[in-house]
Interface confidence: medium
């Protein structure tokens, strides 16, 4: 705590500027106003204040805002945002993209701080769901946003705001993550046409099932190796390798080099090895000719 | 890459003044301060002071340490992207290679100097 | 005005060698410090700030640690082109001030 000392004579703050960076701990204290910082508070982030100046200035906002900052004080916060508290940003409401916006600008090209996190919860809380705007935003900043979400807060995305989601914004999501976003892309892509939509759908197709999967092969959409690897294992396994070689068109040369990776590891498993031998790769590990494959899972259901 | 080229080496009798300009060059969009710091033969840097090199919301008034209050000052010229720094009085002490050095305003205030210029002696001699 | 004490003043050491150098505020800075390199007849180089975070283009051999008024820098394998003296500075409060170097030179 700063203690109470009386402002020297001729030192008392007119207004916010560079004058007031020699100040003493105990002078700042004394002699500033707390409602001119609150109304002057864009200026704070233009002088080069030291960090136990903000600690000072920081003090005099609470005192003067036990409850929690209004926006317009929020807004110009600048880098004194980066000595705010998780608990501090709690009291916020912050309302405003713009406010958002500045606030992310502060923390940019680092990772997403207790704070940052924070402020992003009570944004979204506040708005009731993340529209486009704000996942356009977000993702702006910390692309990989959408994939620190659990499902159940994934649930509340729209699926207009799925337009907003670049490739590189999915490369950290698992697979529940996946299986929650891929429906709401595909609801967001339906009016598309088919080269088109697969090129949009491509970065979701983690949560595909399998009867999605079987009809894209009908579509000669050529999908790369690294993205019929991240596919689910238990959408893959019922391919027939002819759908799996209409799939990968080109690229089913690739299943090679991954032989001994799921799913296609599994999928080989699962695969006639007189079907295996007709892509002329050499896979290995198929079901031997003569063999009877029963499927036990279909077996149980029946039952 | 961002530049700060100072101006050449400056001699000096004891009570006149000398002014140092520092210029800079390449991606200087990021918002910044302009620091002048000295350093005397076999000491570690002094810290002088510090301007905004541009106009802003704040005033643009430069801050000076207090052991050089009524001998410096620092001006800028936004135009040019140049800042100054002129010591008055000058003493024998005042003999040192005087740098300018940026500091970014972004993620951390902004007080550790990420770019420096080349440096500029300065020799107070009688 | 925060004091920045550095030690030692200089050492002796051979390329591979680990070397550390210390430094202590006079009064707690958080984690408020950089560590700086200078070769003769150049400006110092930033390698490290906020303590422990690698400048741009610093080799990783370079590390900084500590918090409140005790910091260090490591050079984890030094090299030839490490001979140099290295400062510390605190930017908590005015006035900004620096170490009193550490020189580091050729067993």
């Known amino acids: 705590e700063v203690e109470k000392t009386a402002c020297p004579s001729g030192k008392k703050a007119r207004e916010i500027d560079e004058s007031l960076i020699f100040y003493k701990k105990w002078e700042l204290e004394a002699c500033v106003d707390a409602a001119l910082l609150a109304t002057q508070m864009d200026r704070v982030n233009a002088i080069p204040f030291t960090y136990e100046q903000l600690d000072v200035l920081k003090h005099k906002l609470d005192e003067l805002y036990p409850q929690g900052y209004p926006e317009s004080v929020i807004q110009h916060l600048g880098y004194l945002f980066l000595k705010m508290s998780p608990e501090d940003i709690r009291k916020w409401n912050v309302t405003s993209l713009e406010t958002l916006k500045a606030l992310l600008e502060v923390n940019k090209g680092h990772e997403m701080s207790p704070q940052v996190a924070t402020l992003i919860d009570r944004f979204v809380k506040g708005r009731g769901q993340l529209d486009k705007d704000t996942l356009d935003t977000l993702t702006a900043f910390y692309p990989g946003y959408l994939c620190s979400l659990s499902p159940e807060e994934l649930s509340s995305v729209p699926p207009s705001s799925i337009w907003a989601v670049r490739p590189q914004d999915l490369d950290t999501c698992d697979p529940r993550q996946l299986d929650v976003l891929y429906p709401k892309a595909r609801l967001a892509f339906q009016n598309m046409n088919g080269s088109e939509y697969f090129v949009k759908i491509q970065s979701f197709l983690g949560g595909a099932p399998t009867e999605d999967l079987k009809a894209l092969s009908q579509q000669n959409v050529s999908m790369d190796l690294a993205t019929f690897m991240k596919l689910r294992t238990d959408a893959v396994l019922p391919l027939t390798v002819a759908e799996v070689q209409k799939l990968l068109g080109p690229h089913v040369e690739g299943l090679k080099a991954e032989e001994r990776h799921r799913p296609v590891r599994d999928w080989i498993l699962r695969q006639r090895q007189d079907d295996l031998d007709t892509l002329g790769l050499g896979l290995q590990g198929g079901i031997p000719n003569g063999y009877l494959v029963l499927d036990l899972s279909m077996q149980e259901a029946l039952s | 890459q961002v530049q700060l080229v100072q101006s050449g080496a400056e001699v000096r009798r004891p009570g006149a003044s000398v002014k140092i300009s520092c210029r800079a060059s390449g991606d200087t969009s990021t918002r910044h301060y302009i620091h002048w710091l000295r350093q005397a033969p076999g000491q570690g840097p002094e810290w002088m002071g510090v301007?905004?090199?541009?106009?802003?919301?704040?005033?643009?008034?430069?801050a000076y340490a207090q052991m050089l209050q009524g001998r410096v000052t620092m001006t800028r010229d936004t135009s040019t992207r140049t800042v100054y720094m002129e010591l008055r009085s000058l003493r024998f002490e005042d003999t040192a290679v005087y740098y300018c050095?940026?500091?970014?305003?972004?993620?951390?205030?902004?007080?550790?100097?990420?770019?420096w210029g080349q440096g500029t002696l300065v020799t107070v001699s009688s | 005005d925060i004091q920045m004490t550095q030690s030692p003043s200089s050492l002796s050491a051979s390329v591979g060698d680990r070397v550390t150098i210390t430094c202590r505020a006079s009064q707690g800075i958080s984690d408020y410090s950089a560590w700086y390199q200078q070769k003769p007849g150049k400006a110092p180089k930033l390698l490290i700030y906020?303590?422990?975070t690698l400048q741009s283009g610093v080799p990783s051999r370079f590390s900084g640690s500590g918090s409140g008024t005790d910091f260090t820098l490591t050079i984890s394998y030094l090299q030839s082109e490490d001979f140099a003296t290295y400062y510390c500075q605190q930017y908590y409060s005015y006035p900004l001030t620096f170490g009193g170097g550490t020189k580091v030179d050729i067993k």
């Open positions: 050095a940026r500091s970014v305003v972004g993620r951390s205030a902004p007080y550790y100097f990420d770019y």
């Open positions: 906020a303590a422990s």
């Open positions: 301007i905004n090199p541009t106009t802003g919301p704040a005033t643009g008034s430069p």
